[in-house]
């Protein structure tokens, strides 16, 4: 059987990104998401 | 865009206080979050607090925390930044910058406009 291994030979950079919640609705507050690899993922 | 102008620095003794203010020209500042940034000497320049449009919301970086406040007055054009319990590692050079809506407010990058700094001493 072949093995496969993920070694993609790069580190991939995570970084806290806030957002404020009126800018995308009406509540107030804060949004934290975090950006893997140039993508919001949360 | 807007222009950014500080001030209200200056030299405080350790746990002392200041307030910053910022002054925006331009019609569109309510269009704007505005953020505090700062550069100690010899290092980056790294996010303080920011305030959103309306002034209803807020956020802060850890080390910040419960000593400083930001604020907004729409009819004034103008944000600040209340100091309270300052610390020597407070030392910097303090920027005002405006950032679109819908921008990560705690990155630099998000930040369109800048004044040209305002410093703060901490030293007995």
């Known amino acids: 059987d072949a093995e496969f291994r993920h070694d993609s030979g790069y580190e991939v950079h995570h970084q806290k990104l806030v957002f404020f919640a009126e800018d995308v609705g009406s509540n107030k507050g804060a949004i934290i998401g975090l950006m893997v690899g140039g993508v919001v993922i949360a | 865009e807007v222009q950014l102008l500080e001030s209200g620095g200056g030299v405080v003794q350790p746990g002392g206080s200041l307030r910053l203010s910022c002054a925006a020209s331009g019609r569109t500042f309510n269009n704007y979050n505005m953020g505090w940034f700062r550069q100690a000497p010899g290092k980056g320049r790294e996010f303080v607090a920011a305030?959103?449009?309306?002034?209803?919301?807020?956020y802060y970086a850890d080390s910040v925390k419960g000593r400083f406040t930001i604020s907004r007055d729409n009819s004034k054009n103008t944000v600040y930044l209340q100091m309270n319990s300052l610390r020597p590692e407070d030392t910097a050079l303090y920027y005002c910058a405006a950032a679109y809506r819908g921008t990560a407010i705690n990155v630099r990058r998000s930040y369109s406009s800048w004044g040209q700094g305002t410093l703060v001493t901490v030293s007995s």
């Open positions: 305030v959103s449009r309306s002034g209803v919301s807020t």
